[in-house]
Interface confidence: low
């Protein structure tokens, strides 16, 4: 049974150019975390995987940096990096767990975090 | 359900083009992505490549690059694969299917299949 | 392109009886596998993703394993109704990439 619950940033924004942190937090299971997958809809930006540490898809290499921790930071970013981003988390014995963060990058300096939220 | 209606059988001539259809039912289009699936007479399976709704991108097997076609309605849920410049090598079952939630990245859902005849 | 070897090409089985069906990846993965079943003249059908993941509906006696770049599916007891073609496929990079397939018929 899948007792954990996945924390986000939720809804976040940052200015055109600058930088975010995605993170995501796994909580509430003694499930071992096997795998992190970060990916857009239609995209894998990066995985860490337990065994074999950070991978960063070779189109993403030069504006995605790994960490801190299980999350990922994006570099130089731009309007067209707006959009979800999903943190999957693979298990082991639950299965896996998915948390969604939506980023809206800003022309302007008006860029604010959103409150956080959860992900059964 | 989720059901996925693809176009009827054809016949066509070397040289010719061929537009197949894909209508998608029971689901939101625009929330996944629809591959395109190849397979000759008693052999494997072939991908040709995939096509986000949404945001409109295409990934194509560099195979098919010149070949197939991929576009999308998001008004009538349909995606749709244009054959071009056919010969005997394109007589094949064509299969469109679903790619599933973001965290599968596969096919769940599939179409029943297109028949492709290539002959003079 | 990432290579994908299946074995073995076809076996058959008796009812009851474990077969495991093997896919090898030319490259590291990272459980980025699937495995499809497609019984005659019907579409392939999805059984597992993410290297262990069983898909909706599926029975029980199907299940996977593996890791890196070698993957496995076994089925706990061959039923009559197994006898398909079973096809590994990589999703990790483009162009996806499917295994030869395995013929697997009842003894």
């Known amino acids: 049974m899948m007792t954990g619950t996945i924390e986000t940033t939720g809804n976040i924004s940052a200015e055109k150019g600058g930088s975010i942190i995605l993170q995501c937090h796994l909580s509430s299971t003694t499930a071992q975390v096997t795998q992190v997958n970060w990916e857009q809809q239609d995209q894998l930006l990066a995985i860490c995987n337990a065994d074999l540490g950070w991978h960063i898809s070779p189109s993403f290499k030069d504006r995605v940096a790994p960490g801190p921790g299980l999350g990922l930071t994006l570099q130089s970013l731009t309007v067209n990096d707006t959009g979800e981003y999903f943190c999957i988390y693979h298990t082991y014995p639950d299965g896996t767990y998915t948390g969604r963060i939506f980023l809206e990058v800003l022309e302007s300096s008006v860029a604010e975090h959103g409150a956080r939220f959860q992900i059964p | 359900q989720v059901q996925l209606q693809e176009s009827g059988a054809e016949l066509a001539r070397p040289g010719a083009s061929v537009k197949l259809s894909c209508k998608a039912s029971?689901?939101?289009?625009?929330?996944?992505?629809i591959s395109w699936v190849k397979q000759r007479t008693g052999q494997g399976l072939e991908w040709i490549g995939e096509?986000?709704?949404?945001?409109?991108?295409?990934y194509y097997n560099e195979k098919f690059k010149g070949k197939a076609t991929l576009t999308a309605d998001k008004s009538s849920s349909t995606a749709y694969m244009e054959l071009s410049s056919l010969t005997s090598e394109d007589s094949a079952v064509y299969f469109c299917?679903?790619?599933?939630?973001?965290?599968?990245?596969?096919?769940?859902?599939w179409g029943q299949g297109t028949i492709l005849t290539v002959s003079s | 392109d990432i290579q994908m070897t299946q074995s073995p090409a076809s076996l058959a089985a008796s009812v009851g009886e474990t077969v495991t069906i093997t896919c090898r990846a030319s490259?590291?993965?990272?459980?980025?596998l699937a495995w499809y079943q497609q019984k005659q003249g019907k579409s392939p059908q999805l059984l597992i993703y993410?290297?262990?993941s069983l898909e909706d509906g599926v029975p029980s006696r199907f299940s996977g394993s593996g890791s890196g770049t070698q993957y496995s599916m076994k089925i706990n007891s061959m039923q009559p109704e197994d006898t398909a073609t079973y096809f590994c496929?990589?999703?990790?990079?483009?162009?996806?990439?499917f295994g030869g397939g395995t013929k697997l018929e009842i003894k």
């Open positions: 496929k990589q999703a990790y990079d483009v162009p996806r990439t």
């Open positions: 299917a679903r790619k599933g939630p973001y965290y599968t990245k596969n096919e769940d859902y």
């Open positions: 490259e590291h993965i990272y459980y980025s």
């Open positions: 993410n290297a262990n």
């Open positions: 096509i986000y709704p949404r945001s409109g991108n295409t």
């Open positions: 029971g689901y939101t289009f625009t929330s996944y992505g």
